[in-house]
Amino acid sequence: QVQLVQSGGGVVQPGRSLRLSCAASGFTFSRYTIHWVRQAPGKGLEWVAVMSYNGNNKHYADSVNGRFTISRNDSKNTLYLNMNSLRPEDTAVYYCARIRDTAMFFAHWGQGTLVTVSSASTKGPSVFPLAPSSKSTSGGTAALGCLVKDYFPEPVTVSWNSGALTSGVHTFPAVLQSSGLYSLSSVVTVPSSSLGTQTYICNVNHKPSNTKVDKKVEPKSC
Amino acid sequence: DIQMTQSPSTLSASVGDRVTITCRASQSINTWLAWYQQKPGKAPKLLMYKASSLESGVPSRFIGSGSGTEFTLTISSLQPDDFATYYCQQYNSDSKMFGQGTKVEVKGTVAAPSVFIFPPSDEQLKSGTASVVCLLNNFYPREAKVQWKVDNALQSGNSQESVTEQDSKDSTYSLSSTLTLSKADYEKHKVYACEVTHQGLSSPVTKSFNRGEC
């Protein structure tokens, strides 16, 4: 069956370059036109570039024209996207997509590869408790949590009590701060009556920086 | 370039419902229109091409129609697998423009948020920054307004919000809003409040604390 396997994504500084690859199998590569499409985090699909099956025609979106170059190597069944002078707004998941015969819609897609353009360096998070108090209690239910702040790049994983506590947990999508670093909160609602007896620990793992933090969250002692 | 405009941007529906998504082109594209379905973290999947031709393997409950500048995608009876984001795409011209997407979400019943406020930890204050977090838990619909007030003065530009995906158990959302200040600014003021407005609340709810008090 038709397969498009992508590689080459990663974190890159503004102004630098990156090359994405799209390795094709299951069809005669040299007969098909393949496009690049991207999707910024939380946004819609944006067409990026196309190269015709014979390499004669290349066409680019205005937003990347002059910076990105599409190419192909038929002997390796691979399509490339050379991205130069990268900008933070180029941060996206990039997909290669093959057309159906000659009609320019996308019948087959690669799995996508994330490109993050940022001047931030790899940094592990600081983990701060969101302590339960009378201000975070409502009708016998208390809320508590962890603030996972100032890390780069994505992702971090958060569990509670080493995965034993899952009910009532909300881990929010990360937000990108003006510093270029990410921050997120993970919260859990529990019975107020359990605060004195049950231990609550958030387990934070940031693989890119090899950071693991276990933070005990307890009511503030006044 | 041909612009594609999709509506609505979000559509709340229930299993069994008939739903219709509209796509308009800024100029005629004949029937050179495709529809895609995308689920979180996945690549888009082709549903329909040439406006009304069903892609092989796609269920017949998906119905495409239209030509020229007006197009619709109808799902005759919505199934659990159909909650996703849908995109139209014109392929009449070189720039293969997509619509901005329509998210089909589960229609829930109105539920007011439980509101909680968290002061910055002493640990964080030692680092020179103060984050005050307001949590809105388990509400529906998604539209909610959070306003920060410091000593009753409305804050703007110094907070960020994040919203969870819809919960598959109860169709609700949760939201966190974080007000970030320097330690010096934080210590200049006393009363920190977050005010929440939502359809499920008869009047806005305010949660607050006095800095330094338990």
Epitope: - | V15, D17, P80, F83, V106, G108, S171
Partner: nanobody, 113 residues
């Protein structure tokens, strides 16, 4: 996830009746509109049968079952029912309930002529 348990299927003579149940594991079930779908042995996809809103005051039926099937719910017991009367051989199918983005596992109904 809300776990949905379909039950009540079986073998019945044409003209007979069956009552299907869809029980949910979670009390949050009551916020959902629930629908019944069916899939015939040769059918490529599941066909809409009936629908009931969260508090039971609105129902909707496929033309093929109108007047014969009745959908109801008991939010105390977290259960939705499909009362099937005057059954026909063409009603033979696996019946599934659905709520939100969740499916039941299906229950087989066979109508013998």
């Amino acid at each position: 996830q809300v776990q949905l348990q379909d039950s009540g299927g079986g073998l019945v003579q044409a003209g007979g009746s069956l009552r299907l149940s869809c029980a949910a594991s979670s009390r949050t079930f009551s916020v959902y509109t629930v629908a019944w779908f069916r899939q015939t042995p040769g059918g490529k996809e599941r066909e809409f049968v009936a629908q009931i809103n969260w508090n039971g005051d609105s129902t909707n039926y496929a033309d093929s079952v109108k007047g014969r099937f009745t959908v109801s719910r008991d939010n105390v017991k977290n259960t939705v029912f499909l009362q099937m009367s005057t059954l026909k051989p063409e009603d033979t199918a696996v019946y599934y309930c659905a709520a939100g983005s969740n499916w039941g596992q299906g229950t087989q109904v066979t109508v013998s002529s």
